[in-house]
Protein backbone atom coordinates (compact mmCIF):
# COMPACT_ATOMS: atom_id res chain seq x y z
CA UNK A 1 0.00 0.00 0.00
CA UNK A 2 1.23 3.53 -0.71
CA UNK A 3 2.55 5.41 2.30
CA UNK A 4 0.02 7.78 3.81
CA UNK A 5 0.64 11.46 2.94
CA UNK A 6 1.30 13.39 6.14
CA UNK A 7 -0.02 16.93 6.43
CA UNK A 8 1.89 19.53 8.41
CA UNK A 9 2.39 19.67 11.24
CA UNK A 10 3.36 16.04 11.80
CA UNK A 11 5.89 14.17 13.88
CA UNK A 12 8.73 12.77 11.78
CA UNK A 13 9.73 9.14 11.93
CA UNK A 14 12.45 8.49 14.54
CA UNK A 15 15.75 9.48 12.88
CA UNK A 16 13.83 10.78 9.90
CA UNK A 17 13.88 14.25 8.36
CA UNK A 18 11.25 16.69 7.26
CA UNK A 19 10.34 17.01 3.61
CA UNK A 20 11.31 19.71 1.15
CA UNK A 21 9.94 23.14 2.13
CA UNK A 22 9.43 21.98 5.67
CA UNK A 23 11.48 22.47 8.80
CA UNK A 24 11.66 20.76 12.17
CA UNK A 25 10.32 22.98 14.93
CA UNK A 26 12.24 22.26 18.16
CA UNK A 27 9.50 23.60 20.42
CA UNK A 28 6.61 21.78 18.79
CA UNK A 29 8.85 18.81 17.85
CA UNK A 30 6.97 18.64 14.59
CA UNK A 31 7.66 19.03 10.88
CA UNK A 32 6.11 22.33 9.87
CA UNK A 33 5.72 24.30 6.64
CA UNK A 34 8.28 26.87 5.61
CA UNK A 35 7.10 30.20 4.21
CA UNK A 36 7.66 30.93 0.51
CA UNK A 37 9.97 33.69 -0.78
CA UNK A 38 8.38 37.09 -0.16
CA UNK A 39 6.85 35.93 3.11
CA UNK A 40 7.96 35.22 6.68
CA UNK A 41 6.67 33.27 9.66
CA UNK A 42 4.11 35.42 11.44
CA UNK A 43 3.10 32.64 13.84
CA UNK A 44 5.21 29.54 14.44
CA UNK A 45 3.60 26.13 14.33
CA UNK A 46 2.37 24.15 17.30
CA UNK A 47 1.54 20.46 17.63
CA UNK A 48 -1.87 21.18 16.19
CA UNK A 49 -1.49 24.21 13.89
CA UNK A 50 0.89 24.89 11.01
CA UNK A 51 3.10 27.92 10.45
CA UNK A 52 1.19 31.09 9.63
CA UNK A 53 2.98 33.13 6.96
CA UNK A 54 2.62 36.80 6.11
CA UNK A 55 3.93 38.99 3.29
CA UNK A 56 7.11 40.97 3.75
CA UNK A 57 6.61 44.67 4.42
CA UNK A 58 7.88 47.37 2.06
CA UNK A 59 11.69 47.51 1.73
CA UNK A 60 12.07 44.03 3.18
CA UNK A 61 12.44 40.66 1.50
CA UNK A 62 13.02 36.93 1.81
CA UNK A 63 14.66 35.20 -1.11
CA UNK A 64 14.32 31.58 0.04
CA UNK A 65 11.75 29.30 1.64
CA UNK A 66 12.11 30.19 5.31
CA UNK A 67 10.75 30.35 8.81
CA UNK A 68 12.27 33.67 9.87
CA UNK A 69 10.16 35.84 12.18
CA UNK A 70 11.00 39.01 10.22
CA UNK A 71 11.94 39.67 6.62
CA UNK A 72 15.41 41.00 5.84
CA UNK A 73 15.87 44.70 5.16
CA UNK A 74 16.81 45.65 1.63
CA UNK A 75 20.16 47.39 1.27
CA UNK A 76 20.25 51.16 1.20
CA UNK A 77 19.75 53.04 -2.04
CA UNK A 78 22.53 52.83 -4.61
CA UNK A 79 25.09 55.62 -4.37
CA UNK A 80 25.76 58.09 -7.16
CA UNK A 81 28.60 56.00 -8.64
CA UNK A 82 26.30 52.98 -8.97
CA UNK A 83 23.26 51.81 -10.85
CA UNK A 84 20.48 49.64 -9.49
CA UNK A 85 20.57 46.43 -11.51
CA UNK A 86 18.00 44.64 -9.35
CA UNK A 87 15.25 46.48 -7.51
CA UNK A 88 14.20 45.73 -3.95
CA UNK A 89 11.11 43.51 -4.04
CA UNK A 90 9.48 41.23 -1.48
CA UNK A 91 11.49 38.35 -2.94
CA UNK A 92 14.90 39.90 -3.65
CA UNK A 93 17.32 42.42 -2.27
CA UNK A 94 18.40 45.49 -4.20
CA UNK A 95 21.62 44.94 -6.15
CA UNK A 96 23.85 47.89 -6.97
CA UNK A 97 26.60 47.63 -9.55
CA UNK A 98 29.15 50.17 -10.63
CA UNK A 99 28.05 52.51 -13.38
CA UNK A 100 29.73 52.54 -16.79
CA UNK A 101 33.30 53.80 -16.62
CA UNK A 102 33.67 52.47 -13.09
CA UNK A 103 34.64 49.06 -11.68
CA UNK A 104 34.10 47.25 -8.40
CA UNK A 105 37.24 47.66 -6.31
CA UNK A 106 35.82 45.88 -3.28
CA UNK A 107 32.94 43.46 -3.63
CA UNK A 108 30.42 42.21 -1.11
CA UNK A 109 28.16 39.15 -1.19
CA UNK A 110 25.73 40.77 -3.59
CA UNK A 111 26.76 43.83 -5.54
CA UNK A 112 29.66 46.12 -4.74
CA UNK A 113 30.99 47.74 -1.57
CA UNK A 114 33.36 50.18 -3.30
CA UNK A 115 33.29 51.45 -6.87
CA UNK A 116 36.25 53.28 -8.41
CA UNK A 117 36.61 55.10 -11.69
CA UNK A 118 38.49 53.21 -14.38
CA UNK A 119 42.05 54.38 -14.83
CA UNK A 120 42.63 56.69 -17.76
CA UNK A 121 45.90 56.02 -19.56
CA UNK A 122 47.70 59.30 -20.23
CA UNK A 123 49.22 60.29 -23.58
CA UNK A 124 52.12 57.98 -24.36
CA UNK A 125 50.32 55.09 -22.67
CA UNK A 126 47.63 52.83 -24.11
CA UNK A 127 45.27 50.26 -22.67
CA UNK A 128 47.03 46.91 -22.27
CA UNK A 129 44.10 45.23 -20.53
CA UNK A 130 40.62 46.72 -20.60
CA UNK A 131 38.69 47.29 -17.42
CA UNK A 132 35.95 44.88 -16.43
CA UNK A 133 33.13 45.01 -13.86
CA UNK A 134 35.64 43.91 -11.22
CA UNK A 135 39.06 45.01 -12.46
CA UNK A 136 40.75 48.25 -13.38
CA UNK A 137 42.32 49.14 -16.71
CA UNK A 138 46.01 48.23 -17.10
CA UNK A 139 48.05 50.78 -19.05
CA UNK A 140 51.31 50.23 -20.91
CA UNK A 141 53.81 52.59 -22.50
CA UNK A 142 53.36 52.78 -26.27
CA UNK A 143 56.08 50.75 -27.97
CA UNK A 144 58.27 52.28 -30.70
CA UNK A 145 56.19 52.82 -33.83
CA UNK A 146 52.96 53.29 -31.89
CA UNK A 147 51.34 56.20 -30.06
CA UNK A 148 48.42 57.38 -27.99
CA UNK A 149 47.65 61.09 -27.80
CA UNK A 150 44.59 60.77 -25.57
CA UNK A 151 43.78 60.43 -21.88
CA UNK A 152 41.46 57.47 -22.04
CA UNK A 153 40.36 54.28 -20.32
CA UNK A 154 39.71 52.59 -23.68
CA UNK A 155 42.25 53.81 -26.26
CA UNK A 156 45.08 51.47 -27.19
CA UNK A 157 48.44 52.44 -28.66
CA UNK A 158 47.98 52.84 -32.43
CA UNK A 159 50.58 52.51 -35.18
CA UNK A 160 52.15 55.67 -36.54
CA UNK A 161 51.03 56.49 -40.03
CA UNK A 162 53.62 55.80 -42.66
CA UNK A 163 54.59 58.86 -44.68
CA UNK A 164 56.14 59.24 -48.14
CA UNK A 165 58.10 62.05 -46.51
CA UNK A 166 58.03 62.61 -42.76
CA UNK A 167 57.63 66.22 -41.65
CA UNK A 168 57.77 65.37 -37.94
CA UNK A 169 58.55 61.84 -36.68
CA UNK A 170 56.00 60.23 -34.44
CA UNK A 171 56.70 59.33 -30.84
CA UNK A 172 54.81 57.57 -28.05
CA UNK A 173 52.39 60.45 -27.56
CA UNK A 174 52.10 61.81 -31.10
CA UNK A 175 51.49 60.41 -34.56
CA UNK A 176 53.97 61.06 -37.34
CA UNK A 177 53.21 64.17 -39.38
CA UNK A 178 53.55 63.76 -43.14
CA UNK A 179 54.52 66.46 -45.63
CA UNK A 180 51.69 65.36 -47.93
CA UNK A 181 48.15 64.45 -46.96
CA UNK A 182 48.47 60.97 -48.43
CA UNK A 183 50.44 58.53 -46.30
CA UNK A 184 51.54 55.31 -47.99
CA UNK A 185 49.14 53.15 -46.06
CA UNK A 186 45.80 53.80 -44.47
CA UNK A 187 46.14 55.32 -41.07
CA UNK A 188 44.76 54.13 -37.80
CA UNK A 189 41.41 55.82 -37.15
CA UNK A 190 41.85 59.26 -35.71
CA UNK A 191 45.53 59.50 -36.57
CA UNK A 192 46.76 62.96 -37.41
CA UNK A 193 47.98 63.50 -40.96
CA UNK A 194 47.93 67.27 -41.30
CA UNK A 195 50.70 69.39 -39.81
CA UNK A 196 49.82 70.64 -36.36
CA UNK A 197 51.55 72.25 -33.38
CA UNK A 198 53.93 69.80 -31.80
CA UNK A 199 54.60 69.37 -28.12
CA UNK A 200 57.42 67.28 -26.74
CA UNK A 201 55.54 66.82 -23.49
CA UNK A 202 52.43 64.75 -22.93
CA UNK A 203 49.39 66.97 -22.71
CA UNK A 204 46.87 66.26 -19.96
CA UNK A 205 43.19 66.90 -20.36
CA UNK A 206 42.42 66.50 -16.67
CA UNK A 207 43.02 69.02 -13.91
CA UNK A 208 46.14 68.07 -11.99
CA UNK A 209 46.14 69.36 -8.43
CA UNK A 210 48.54 68.05 -5.84
CA UNK A 211 48.79 64.29 -6.02
CA UNK A 212 49.19 63.25 -2.44
CA UNK A 213 45.52 63.08 -1.51
CA UNK A 214 43.45 59.92 -1.78
CA UNK A 215 41.54 59.60 -5.06
CA UNK A 216 38.38 61.66 -5.25
CA UNK A 217 35.52 59.85 -3.59
CA UNK A 218 31.78 60.19 -3.39
CA UNK A 219 32.43 61.71 0.03
CA UNK A 220 34.00 64.64 -1.89
CA UNK A 221 37.61 64.06 -0.95
CA UNK A 222 40.08 65.94 -3.17
CA UNK A 223 40.80 64.48 -6.59
CA UNK A 224 44.42 63.74 -7.47
CA UNK A 225 45.81 64.02 -10.98
CA UNK A 226 44.71 60.62 -12.14
CA UNK A 227 43.96 58.10 -9.40
CA UNK A 228 40.34 57.04 -9.69
CA UNK A 229 37.36 58.58 -8.10
CA UNK A 230 35.82 56.08 -5.79
CA UNK A 231 32.52 55.72 -4.03
CA UNK A 232 31.04 53.65 -1.28
CA UNK A 233 27.70 51.95 -0.99
CA UNK A 234 25.72 51.53 2.15
CA UNK A 235 25.78 47.98 3.43
Amino acid sequence: LPAQVAFTPYAPEPGGTCRLREYYDQTAQMCCSKCPPGQHAKVFCTKTSDTVCDSCEDSTYTQLWNWVPECLSCGSRCSSDQVETQACTREQNRICTCRPGWYCALSKQEGCRLCAQLRKCRPGFGVARPGTETSDVVCKPCAPGTFSNTTSSTDICRPHQICHVVAIPGNASMDAVCTSTSPTRSMAPGAVHLPQPVSTRSQHTQPTPAPSTAPGTSFLLPVGPSPPAEGSTGD
Epitope: A105, R119, C121, R122, A214
Partner: antibody
Framework: EVQLVESGGGLVQPGGSLRLSCAAS????????LSWVRQAPGKGLEWVAY????????YYSDTVKGRFTISRDNAKNTLYLQMNSLRAEDTAVYYC??????????????WGQGTLVTVSS | DIQMTQSPSSLSASVGDRVTITCRTS??????LPWYQQKPGKAPKLLLY???KLAEGVPSRFSGSGSGTDYTLTISSLQPEDFATYYC?????????FGQGTKVEIK
Protein backbone atom coordinates in the same frame (compact mmCIF):
# COMPACT_ATOMS: atom_id res chain seq x y z
CA GLU B 1 46.10 60.29 7.33
CA VAL B 2 47.79 57.89 4.93
CA GLN B 3 49.98 55.38 6.78
CA LEU B 4 52.15 52.52 5.52
CA VAL B 5 53.77 50.38 8.20
CA GLU B 6 56.27 47.70 7.19
CA SER B 7 57.14 44.67 9.30
CA GLY B 8 58.89 41.32 8.91
CA GLY B 9 62.47 42.49 8.42
CA GLY B 10 65.38 40.95 10.26
CA LEU B 11 68.54 38.90 9.98
CA VAL B 12 68.47 35.92 7.63
CA GLN B 13 71.14 33.61 6.24
CA PRO B 14 72.02 33.54 2.53
CA GLY B 15 69.60 31.23 0.72
CA GLY B 16 66.94 31.85 3.34
CA SER B 17 63.47 33.36 3.06
CA LEU B 18 61.62 36.25 4.61
CA ARG B 19 58.15 37.69 4.19
CA LEU B 20 57.63 41.41 4.55
CA SER B 21 54.21 42.90 5.28
CA CYS B 22 52.91 46.42 4.90
CA ALA B 23 49.77 47.44 6.76
CA ALA B 24 48.04 50.36 5.06
CA SER B 25 45.46 52.78 6.43
CA UNK B 26 43.97 56.17 5.68
CA UNK B 27 43.06 55.56 2.03
CA UNK B 28 40.99 53.26 -0.16
CA UNK B 29 43.61 50.51 -0.36
CA UNK B 30 41.91 48.45 -3.05
CA UNK B 31 41.96 51.31 -5.56
CA UNK B 32 45.72 51.99 -5.41
CA UNK B 33 48.73 50.36 -7.04
CA LEU B 34 51.61 49.67 -4.64
CA SER B 35 55.34 48.96 -4.83
CA TRP B 36 58.38 47.97 -2.82
CA VAL B 37 61.54 50.09 -3.04
CA ARG B 38 64.79 49.24 -1.27
CA GLN B 39 67.92 51.09 -0.23
CA ALA B 40 71.16 49.30 0.59
CA PRO B 41 73.15 50.87 3.45
CA GLY B 42 74.76 54.10 2.24
CA LYS B 43 73.46 53.57 -1.31
CA GLY B 44 70.73 54.95 -3.55
CA LEU B 45 67.13 53.88 -4.11
CA GLU B 46 66.18 50.81 -6.13
CA TRP B 47 62.65 49.91 -7.23
CA VAL B 48 61.97 46.23 -6.50
CA ALA B 49 58.40 45.23 -7.33
CA TYR B 50 54.97 46.58 -8.25
CA UNK B 51 51.41 45.28 -8.03
CA UNK B 52 48.32 46.95 -9.46
CA UNK B 53 45.20 47.66 -7.42
CA UNK B 54 43.44 44.40 -8.24
CA UNK B 55 46.56 42.25 -7.94
CA UNK B 56 46.30 41.23 -11.61
CA UNK B 57 49.43 42.93 -12.87
CA UNK B 58 52.89 42.59 -11.27
CA TYR B 59 56.33 43.80 -12.36
CA TYR B 60 59.76 43.07 -10.88
CA SER B 61 63.27 44.44 -11.24
CA ASP B 62 65.66 42.04 -12.95
CA THR B 63 67.68 41.66 -9.74
CA VAL B 64 64.79 40.00 -7.86
CA LYS B 65 62.75 38.39 -10.67
CA GLY B 66 62.08 34.71 -9.92
CA ARG B 67 63.08 35.07 -6.26
CA PHE B 68 60.66 37.68 -4.89
CA THR B 69 56.86 37.69 -5.10
CA ILE B 70 54.69 40.71 -4.46
CA SER B 71 51.07 40.13 -3.41
CA ARG B 72 48.26 41.91 -1.63
CA ASP B 73 45.14 41.20 0.39
CA ASN B 74 42.61 43.94 -0.28
CA ALA B 75 40.29 42.65 2.44
CA LYS B 76 43.09 43.10 5.00
CA ASN B 77 44.60 46.29 3.53
CA THR B 78 47.97 44.57 3.46
CA LEU B 79 50.81 44.35 0.93
CA TYR B 80 53.37 41.54 1.03
CA LEU B 81 56.81 40.77 -0.33
CA GLN B 82 57.87 37.13 -0.20
CA MET B 83 61.64 36.98 -0.53
CA ASN B 84 63.27 33.63 -1.30
CA SER B 85 66.86 32.61 -2.11
CA LEU B 86 68.14 35.71 -0.36
CA ARG B 87 71.63 37.00 -1.14
CA ALA B 88 74.00 39.33 0.68
CA GLU B 89 73.24 42.01 -1.92
CA ASP B 90 69.56 41.97 -0.89
CA THR B 91 70.58 43.60 2.41
CA ALA B 92 68.70 46.89 2.51
CA VAL B 93 65.95 48.93 4.07
CA TYR B 94 62.74 47.93 2.28
CA TYR B 95 60.10 50.61 1.83
CA CYS B 96 56.43 49.99 1.13
CA UNK B 97 55.25 52.77 -1.19
CA UNK B 98 51.95 53.88 -2.65
CA UNK B 99 52.05 54.16 -6.42
CA UNK B 100 52.64 54.52 -9.20
CA UNK B 101 49.04 54.66 -10.47
CA UNK B 102 50.81 53.36 -13.54
CA UNK B 103 50.01 54.94 -16.88
CA UNK B 104 48.01 57.65 -15.19
CA UNK B 105 49.75 59.13 -12.14
CA UNK B 106 53.37 58.06 -12.30
CA UNK B 107 55.00 58.69 -8.93
CA UNK B 108 55.37 57.30 -5.41
CA UNK B 109 53.41 59.66 -3.19
CA UNK B 110 53.58 57.96 0.22
CA TRP B 111 56.37 55.92 1.76
CA GLY B 112 56.49 53.73 4.85
CA GLN B 113 59.25 54.14 7.43
CA GLY B 114 61.07 51.08 6.07
CA THR B 115 62.12 47.73 7.52
CA LEU B 116 65.72 46.52 7.54
CA VAL B 117 66.57 43.16 5.96
CA THR B 118 70.06 41.86 6.66
CA VAL B 119 71.31 38.82 4.75
CA SER B 120 74.43 37.47 6.41
CA SER B 121 75.92 34.20 7.63
CA ASP C 1 66.84 49.32 -19.40
CA ILE C 2 66.67 53.10 -19.29
CA GLN C 3 69.78 54.60 -17.73
CA MET C 4 69.42 57.60 -15.42
CA THR C 5 72.42 59.90 -15.15
CA GLN C 6 72.04 62.38 -12.31
CA SER C 7 74.56 65.15 -11.77
CA PRO C 8 76.30 66.31 -9.78
CA SER C 9 76.61 63.44 -7.31
CA SER C 10 77.17 66.01 -4.57
CA LEU C 11 77.38 69.76 -4.20
CA SER C 12 78.15 72.26 -1.47
CA ALA C 13 76.02 75.37 -1.25
CA SER C 14 75.06 78.11 1.16
CA VAL C 15 71.66 79.18 2.42
CA GLY C 16 70.09 81.46 -0.19
CA ASP C 17 71.98 79.92 -3.13
CA ARG C 18 70.25 78.81 -6.31
CA VAL C 19 70.84 75.10 -6.80
CA THR C 20 70.33 73.11 -9.99
CA ILE C 21 70.38 69.32 -10.29
CA THR C 22 70.08 67.59 -13.65
CA CYS C 23 68.88 64.18 -14.71
CA ARG C 24 69.51 62.73 -18.15
CA THR C 25 67.83 59.55 -19.43
CA SER C 26 69.12 57.20 -22.10
CA UNK C 27 65.85 57.54 -24.04
CA UNK C 28 62.79 59.76 -23.94
CA UNK C 29 60.60 59.18 -20.89
CA UNK C 30 57.91 61.68 -21.94
CA UNK C 31 58.09 63.67 -18.69
CA UNK C 32 57.15 60.65 -16.59
CA LEU C 33 59.67 61.81 -14.01
CA PRO C 34 59.25 62.55 -10.30
CA TRP C 35 61.86 64.08 -7.97
CA TYR C 36 62.26 62.98 -4.33
CA GLN C 37 64.03 64.44 -1.31
CA GLN C 38 65.55 62.19 1.36
CA LYS C 39 67.00 63.20 4.69
CA PRO C 40 69.31 60.88 6.68
CA GLY C 41 67.44 58.06 8.42
CA LYS C 42 64.13 59.06 6.83
CA ALA C 43 62.01 57.78 3.95
CA PRO C 44 62.09 59.76 0.70
CA LYS C 45 59.43 62.41 0.10
CA LEU C 46 57.82 63.31 -3.22
CA LEU C 47 58.74 66.83 -4.37
CA LEU C 48 57.64 67.03 -8.01
CA TYR C 49 55.91 64.76 -10.50
CA UNK C 50 55.44 64.82 -14.27
CA UNK C 51 58.81 66.65 -14.32
CA UNK C 52 57.29 70.04 -13.52
CA LYS C 53 54.35 69.70 -11.11
CA LEU C 54 54.78 70.50 -7.45
CA ALA C 55 53.52 67.88 -4.98
CA GLU C 56 51.16 68.98 -2.22
CA GLY C 57 52.80 70.91 0.58
CA VAL C 58 56.09 71.43 -1.24
CA PRO C 59 57.42 75.00 -1.12
CA SER C 60 57.38 76.98 -4.35
CA ARG C 61 61.17 77.49 -4.25
CA PHE C 62 61.33 73.99 -5.75
CA SER C 63 60.67 73.79 -9.47
CA GLY C 64 61.22 71.33 -12.28
CA SER C 65 61.71 71.63 -16.01
CA GLY C 66 62.64 69.52 -18.98
CA SER C 67 61.23 67.06 -21.48
CA GLY C 68 62.37 64.15 -23.60
CA THR C 69 65.67 63.03 -22.04
CA ASP C 70 66.81 66.09 -20.08
CA TYR C 71 65.31 67.21 -16.78
CA THR C 72 66.26 69.73 -14.11
CA LEU C 73 65.34 70.30 -10.47
CA THR C 74 65.95 73.85 -9.25
CA ILE C 75 65.89 75.20 -5.71
CA SER C 76 65.65 78.95 -6.17
CA SER C 77 66.86 79.92 -2.69
CA LEU C 78 68.31 77.14 -0.59
CA GLN C 79 66.95 76.91 2.95
CA PRO C 80 68.52 75.10 5.94
CA GLU C 81 65.91 72.32 5.72
CA ASP C 82 66.80 71.65 2.07
CA PHE C 83 70.15 70.02 2.86
CA ALA C 84 69.39 66.46 1.83
CA THR C 85 69.83 63.95 -0.98
CA TYR C 86 67.70 64.36 -4.11
CA TYR C 87 66.70 61.58 -6.52
CA CYS C 88 65.07 61.61 -9.93
CA UNK C 89 63.23 58.55 -11.22
CA UNK C 90 61.56 57.51 -14.46
CA UNK C 91 58.20 55.82 -14.93
CA UNK C 92 58.43 54.80 -18.54
CA UNK C 93 59.13 51.12 -19.29
CA UNK C 94 60.15 48.85 -16.41
CA UNK C 95 62.47 48.66 -14.59
CA UNK C 96 61.72 52.04 -13.06
CA UNK C 97 65.21 53.21 -12.21
CA PHE C 98 66.31 56.06 -9.96
CA GLY C 99 69.17 58.44 -10.52
CA GLN C 100 72.13 57.76 -8.24
CA GLY C 101 71.25 60.78 -6.08
CA THR C 102 72.65 64.25 -5.47
CA LYS C 103 73.73 65.10 -1.94
CA VAL C 104 73.31 68.81 -1.17
CA GLU C 105 75.64 69.76 1.66
CA ILE C 106 76.28 72.96 3.60
CA LYS C 107 79.30 74.89 2.33
Amino acid sequence: EVQLVESGGGLVQPGGSLRLSCAASGFAFSTYDLSWVRQAPGKGLEWVAYINNGGISTYYSDTVKGRFTISRDNAKNTLYLQMNSLRAEDTAVYYCVRGPFYGSANYFDYWGQGTLVTVSS
Amino acid sequence: DIQMTQSPSSLSASVGDRVTITCRTSESIYSNLPWYQQKPGKAPKLLLYDATKLAEGVPSRFSGSGSGTDYTLTISSLQPEDFATYYCQHFWVTPWTFGQGTKVEIK
